[in-house]
Interface confidence: low
């Protein structure tokens, strides 16, 4: 009778992560009697995957009933495959021995390759906000994919970006890989509503790439422009001065009126109007009683935006032409919607 051969018909098997791998193995003879075992890898460091005789292997099922005396099919199924399961699997026939079974013959091995989808790309922007015209870096990371070949693209509002660098790690063989890319984006004043998109294409995605996004609203700071104007006189000896705070983002903004360098009122912008580009406008006004001033008044609108150093715009109010009203000591009346007390 011909000597038993262990046949592994598949040189390689490709399985998607999460699926079940079938590793085929047959023997050409029932003799000698003895169990089979499956190993990953060869040599002294090989890893036991399945032992027909003993042990608990919850992820492994046999294709046929190995307890049948005439069974020569030793194929197994390994469930819930992950990239860590990649490797070469050997079906090994043992013959009965005393006290231990003795390895008799091994199959040629089947290489299991795992196709693992990349994780959803995570896009992260700079830790601190930046202003228009500045270049900021965005990173995109995706992990756990196999095989190594992968394509990554960057877009801003649908337009493909070209200024980026991408690395796939590790460089050598691995069960799975990671990709890391850094793109440089120049901010514009219109970017509050903009999005940066990182798109990853991989063989496992069947033409439907994964995308990660970052909203530039979390990255951009659009500093306000200030305009201080004197409105027509509302009443005798009273002048209404407005400070238009335009095109700022984010909303957190604090405005202080100063009269000749002295703080008159501080407000926080809470009721703002939103522009089409996502920036905000706000207006504060000050009613100045000119009769309380003997000299010209320098009115300053000072704005602290998003924790940045204050910017200001001043307006010189000429009071010499106005008649003095005796007994008045109120220099400014608080007409703003948001009051802040100071001093």
């Amino acid at each position: 009778e011909e000597e038993l051969q262990v046949i592994q018909p598949d040189k390689s098997v490709l399985v998607a992560a999460g699926e079940t791998a079938t590793l085929r193995c047959t023997a050409t003879s029932l003799i000698p009697v003895g169990p089979i075992q499956w190993f990953r890898g060869a040599g002294p460091g090989r890893e036991l995957i399945y032992n027909q005789k003993e042990g608990h292997f919850p992820r492994v099922t046999t294709v046929s009933d190995l307890t049948k005396r005439n069974n020569m099919d030793f194929s197994i199924r390994i469930g819930n495959i992950t990239p860590a399961d990649a490797g070469t699997y050997y079906c090994v026939k043992f013959r009965k021995g005393s006290p231990d079974d003795v390895e008799f013959k091994s199959g040629a091995g089947t290489e299991l390759s795992v196709r693992a989808k990349p994780s959803a790309p995570v896009v992260s922007g700079p830790a601190a906000r930046a202003t228009p015209q500045h270049t900021v870096s965005f990173t995109c990371e995706s992990h756990g994919f196999s095989p190594r070949d992968i394509t990554l693209k960057w877009f801003k509002n649908g337009n493909e970006l070209s200024d980026f660098q991408t690395n796939v790690d590790p460089v050598g063989e691995s069960v799975s890989y990671s990709i890391h890319s850094t793109a440089k984006v120049v901010l514009t004043r219109e970017d509050v509503h903009s999005q940066v998109i990182c798109e990853v294409a991989h063989v496992t995605l069947q033409g439907d790439p994964l995308r990660g996004t970052a909203n530039l609203s979390e990255t951009i700071r659009v500093p306000p422009t200030l305009e201080v104007t004197q409105q027509p006189v509302r009443a005798e000896n009273q002048v209404n001065v407005t400070c238009q705070v335009r095109k700022f983002y984010p909303q957190r903004l604090q405005l202080t009126w100063l009269e000749n360098g002295n703080v008159s009122r501080t407000e926080t912008a809470s009721t703002v109007t939103e522009n089409k580009d996502g920036t905000y406008n706000w207006m504060s006004w000050l009613l100045v009683n000119v009769s309380a001033h003997r000299d010209d008044v320098k009115l300053t609108c000072q704005v602290e935006h998003d924790g940045q150093p204050a910017v200001s715009k001043s307006h010189d109010l000429k009071v010499s032409a106005h008649p003095k009203e005796q007994g008045s000591n109120t220099a400014a009346e608080n007409t703003g919607s948001n009051e802040r007390n100071i001093y």
Epitope: T268, S270, R340, N341, I342
Partner: antibody, heavy 122, light 107 residues
Amino acid sequence: QVQLVESGGGLVKPGGSLRLSCAASGFTFSSYSMHWVRQAPGKGLEWVSSISSSDSWIYYADSVKGRFTISRDNAKNSLYLQMNSLRAEDTAVYYCAKEPRSYWHGYGMDVWGQGTTVTVSS
Amino acid sequence: DIQMTQSPSSLSASVGDRVTITCQASQDISNYLNWYQQKPGKAPKLLIYDASNLETGVPSRFSGSGSGTDFTFTISSLQPEDIATYYCQQLSNYPITFGGGTKVEIK
């Protein structure tokens, strides 16, 4: 770790003065706005005063305006509250507290001291 | 000044109960609202900032919501260690103002 320790409380007669101190450690004191908040016995919390990191912005509650003065010494990592013309209604536990974000105020109070008791009574 | 009206002023609930506290501002304060916990004899502790953000290290059973004038603070499953007084605080304008507090007790 971040810590605030108040001191200077005590018993004082109406019309008298006290100076509270708050020693800060574990963070860059000069970068953070600071607050004083008080709590009368059995009552709720009442904000008293705030000072920005560089002294440029100071705020007071109407109830203490003109009587209390907040100040800070960034070199000594210390916050102060000078209380003059004290009244019975100023009796409270006084807490100092720091802002969560550096160089900016209006986010709240993320670290508090243990409080120091001020009693105004004749 | 912006008034903060907190309700109820006190409540008693069983361990595991869902507890809800409301806070109403006298004018629009956007999301500039914080929630604090104060245990007897202790300093207040920041739990929620900007209406709905959980401060680092605070258990996830605490949550906050709301914007404008109406805000809600929730303890999804009351624990014995949650016995305390809870305060809302507006930071939209100076003077900073607190709600009157809600004392939470265990039945």
